[in-house]
């Protein structure tokens, strides 16, 4: 059966978007009116992985695009970075585990903890600007709460 | 309020190793980064390492070859840092800050003085 | 590993006048460095973070600019405690996070 989709964009809870910031990098920054258009669609697939009630597995692709945020060393530190894959054997229900977050919810907000590297997570700054980033903390100064909005495909 | 408070200066002799803790309060520990820098007498600043404390994940400057060593105890909301094999060089005041994924380390410890003779 | 320099080694300003720090990266950081003011016998305090925001407890007469490689810290009108050293740090590529070799602001 083929792995089931659905389009999404997410927005942390300072209420800043994503955009794409050059071909490989995705920035958090507030927007209005019809600078919402920048914002990137996700097509999140829900994922064979480790599941219970509130923690559901998903990659997370750009839409229409053969890019997926994927988590790796990079000089030692768990990275989070948009990875190009071949279109034609992507998406899949059994991916890779670099591309694979595990969704908790919590009182209605949503934090993606990476599979591959436990206890890190798809983070933004307080600040303008700045590259979504994989992230080590929670509850502190930097943001892994998030709240996503559907799209019609 | 926020604080970072330090063990008290030490003197150790060349080829001896030295422990300094940070003990935090007044935030959420596993919240923040917690790094250790440290400044030669009339020298900059130079940054040695980091520990996470929620993951106790930890990366150190390349140029201590593994000499740092920093561990953390989350019922006590401290972070340790071990420097060994000193050397003269190794004279400095070493400090604890707390910082945000990009580096803002906007509450600093008060400083450890480590005086390395023989 | 990104390398921070800074200009000039010492500045020497007059009180009330306006004192210019300088830092470049020797590549694009974008926005992600600090400043921080070291008085003698203390600890770095943090001034400005990400280039150009302020930070609580800070007076406004200090101020950040700058993005990719060229920075400025900027105190409209020195005061007699402002006379210390001054870092700049980049936290866009770690690790290492990395400082400029400092400025002395001295009395003229």
């Known amino acids: 059966a083929p792995v089931r989709s659905l389009n999404c964009t997410l927005r942390d809870s300072q209420q800043k978007s994503l955009v794409m910031s050059g071909p490989y990098e995705l920035k958090a920054l507030h927007l209005q009116g019809q600078d919402m258009e920048q914002q990137v669609v996700f097509s999140m697939s829900f994922v064979q992985g480790e599941e219970s009630n509130d923690k559901i597995p998903v990659a997370l692709g750009l839409k229409e695009k053969n890019l997926y945020l994927s988590c790796v060393l990079k000089d030692d530190k768990p990275t989070l970075q948009l990875e190009s894959v071949d279109p034609k054997n992507y998406p899949k229900k059994k991916m890779e585990k670099r591309f694979v977050f595990n969704k908790i919810e919590i009182n209605n907000k949503l934090e993606f903890e990476s599979a591959q590297f436990p206890n890190w997570y798809i983070s933004t700054s307080q600040a303008e600007n700045m590259p979504v980033f994989l992230g080590g903390t929670k509850g502190g100064q930097d943001i892994t709460d998030f709240t996503m909005q559907f799209v019609s495909s | 309020q926020v604080q970072l408070v330090q063990s008290g200066a030490e003197v150790k002799k060349p080829g001896a190793s030295v422990k300094v803790s940070c003990k935090a309060s007044g935030f959420s520990f596993t919240g923040y980064y917690m790094h250790w820098v440290r400044q030669a007498p009339g020298q900059g600043l130079e940054w040695m390492g980091l520990i996470i404390p929620h993951n106790d994940y930890t990366v150190n400057n390349q140029k201590f070859k593994g000499r740092v060593t920093m561990t953390r105890d989350t019922s006590t909301s401290t972070v340790y840092m071990e420097l060994s094999s000193l050397r003269s060089e190794d004279t400095a005041v070493y400090y604890c800050?707390?910082?945000?994924?990009?580096?803002?380390?906007?509450?600093w410890g008060q400083g450890t003085l480590v005086t390395v003779s023989s | 590993e990104i390398v921070m320099t800074q200009s000039p080694a010492t500045l020497s300003v007059s009180p009330g006048e306006r004192a210019t720090f300088s830092c470049r990266a020797s590549?694009?950081?974008?926005?992600?460095i600090h400043w921080y003011q070291q008085r003698p016998g203390q600890a770095p305090r943090l001034l400005i973070k990400y280039a150009s925001n302020d930070v609580e407890g800070i007076p406004a007469r200090f101020s950040g600019s700058g993005s990719g490689t060229e920075f400025t810290l900027t105190i409209s009108s020195l005061q007699s405690e402002d006379f210390a050293d001054y870092y700049c740090q980049q936290g866009s590529s770690w690790p290492p996070f990395t400082f400029g070799q400092g400025t002395k602001l001295e009395i003229k």
């Open positions: 590549q694009n950081i974008g926005t992600s």
């Open positions: 800050a707390r910082s945000d994924y990009y580096g803002a380390m906007d509450y």
